[in-house]
C-alpha cells in the first residue's frame, strides 16, 4: 500500500531513507531538454524475492530535440552534481542496508535525470532525518518517522527533531545521538491495530547504523 | 517496464458513453487514479479506486462516471455515461496518493475524450 503523503517536513532538515521497502516506486524523470524515451517506464519499481530485491525498469532519457539518441549510463561527475533530491544525499552508503531483507538500496543515477527525485513510499518505510549544513539537532527522542497504516488510513510518525541554527561545526555531536527509546514517540492511536511490516527489524537496522548516519557532517 | 497505457478515448456526442481502459503493465497493485486535463487547465482527479476497490469521485463526475479495476488483468477503467462538453479533455491514469498533488507522478501519454456535437 502506497503512504498516502510524503514524510513530515521539519524546518533546516532533510530526511534520507537508507533503504527502500518493495513496492517504492521513483519516478522515472528527466531533466529540462531530454524526455522519457518512447515506451520507456514511468517508474522504477523496487521489487523482489525472499532472498534478493532490486529495482525493476531502468529510466531512460533521450534529447527532447533527437528522436532516436537513447542513453542509459553512469553521469559525469559534474551532472551527478546538478541532481539534488527532497531527500539529503548521504556522504557514505552504509554497507548494512544492503543486507536488509525485502529492501532496495538507492538506486544508480541514470544519465539526464531530473534534479529532484520522487519517490512513493510503502507502509512500513523508515526515513532518517539531519540537519541541513549551518544547524545542529537537539534530540527528544528518535529522528526518524515510518509510515503506518491505522484504521485504514496512511501517515508517518512525527520525527522527533529540532534543528537549532547555533553556530556549531558540527550538527550532529556524538553526545547528541538519537534515543533508541520509543517514549520520544508519541502514539495517539494506541487502541487502534497499526501495521507496520518490517518496523522492528528496521530499528535493529537503525541502531546498527546510527554512527555512520548521524556523526557524519552533511556535505 | 511500468507502462500506463490509456485507450477508448474519441469523439463522442453529449449525453452519450465512453469506456476508458489503462492497462498497467510492471504496476503493483496500489490505489490508482483517472485525471483529467483540459485545455489551458490544470491536471485534476476526476476518480480513484483503492487496491481493495473503495472508489471515490470528483464532485463534478459523481453519479456519471463509475471507475473499476480487474486486479487479474492489472486494467482500471473509467465508464463515462452522459458525458458534458465540460468533460473535455486528456484522460491519464496513474497511481493515487490522497495527499500527493499529481504534479509529483510521472505521466503517460493519455487517451483524447472530446465531447461536441
Known amino acids: 500500500e502506497l503512504c498516502d503523503d510524503d514524510p513530515p517536513e521539519i524546518p533546516h532538515a532533510t530526511f534520507k531513507a537508507m533503504a527502500y521497502k518493495e513496492g517504492t516506486m521513483l519516478n522515472c524523470e528527466c531533466k529540462r531538454g531530454f524526455r522519457r524515451i518512447k515506451s520507456g517506464s514511468l517508474y522504477m519499481l523496487c521489487t523482489g524475492n525472499s532472498s534478493h530485491s532490486s529495482w525493476d525498469n531502468q529510466c531512460q532519457c533521450t534529447s527532447s530535440a533527437t528522436r532516436n539518441t537513447t542513453k542509459q549510463v553512469t553521469p559525469q561527475p559534474e551532472e551527478q552534481k546538478e541532481r539534488k533530491t527532497t531527500e539529503m544525499q548521504s556522504p557514505m552508503q552504509p554497507v548494512d542496508q544492503a543486507s536488509l531483507p525485502g529492501h532496495c538500496r538507492e538506486p544508480p543515477p541514470w544519465e539526464n535525470e531530473a534534479t529532484e527525485r520522487i519517490y512513493h513510499f510503502v507502509v512500513g518505510q523508515m526515513v532518517y532525518y539531519q540537519c541541513v549544513q549551518g544547524y545542529r539537532a537537539l534530540h527528544r527522542g528518535p529522528a526518524e518517522s515510518v509510515c503506518k497504516m491505522t484504521h485504514g488510513k496512511t501517515r508517518w510518525t512525527q520525527p522527533q527533531l529540532i534543528c537549532t541554527g547555533e553556530m556549531e561545526t558540527s550538527q550532529f555531536p556524538g553526545e547528541e545521538k538519537p534515543q533508541a527509546s520509543p517514549e520520544g514517540r508519541p502514539e495517539s492511536e494506541t487502541s487502534c491495530l497499526v501495521t507496520t511490516t518490517d518496523f522492528q527489524i528496521q530499528t535493529e537496522m537503525a541502531a546498527t547504523m546510527e554512527t555512520s548516519i548521524f556523526t557524519t557532517e552533511y556535505q | 517496464e511500468v507502462q500506463l497505457v490509456e485507450s477508448g478515448g474519441g469523439l463522442v456526442q453529449p449525453g452519450g458513453s465512453l469506456r476508458l481502459s489503462c492497462a498497467a503493465s510492471?504496476?503493483?497493485?496500489?490505489?490508482m487514479g483517472w485525471y483529467r486535463q483540459a485545455p489551458g487547465k490544470q491536471r485534476e482527479l476526476v476518480a480513484s479506486?483503492?487496491?481493495?476497490?473503495?472508489?471515490g469521485y470528483a464532485d463534478s463526475v459523481k453519479g456519471r462516471f463509475t471507475i473499476s479495476r480487474d486486479n487479474a488483468k492489472k486494467t482500471v477503467y473509467l465508464q463515462m455515461n452522459s458525458v458534458r462538453p465540460e468533460d473535455t479533455g486528456v484522460y491519464y491514469c496513474?497511481?493515487?496518493?490522497?495527499?500527493?498533488?499529481?504534479?509529483?507522478?510521472?505521466w503517460g501519454q493519455g487517451t483524447q475524450v472530446t465531447v461536441s456535437s
Open positions: 510492471g504496476m503493483p497493485l496500489v490505489a
Open positions: 496513474n497511481i493515487y496518493r490522497s495527499q500527493v498533488p499529481p504534479t509529483r507522478y510521472s
Open positions: 479506486i483503492s487496491s481493495g476497490g473503495n472508489t
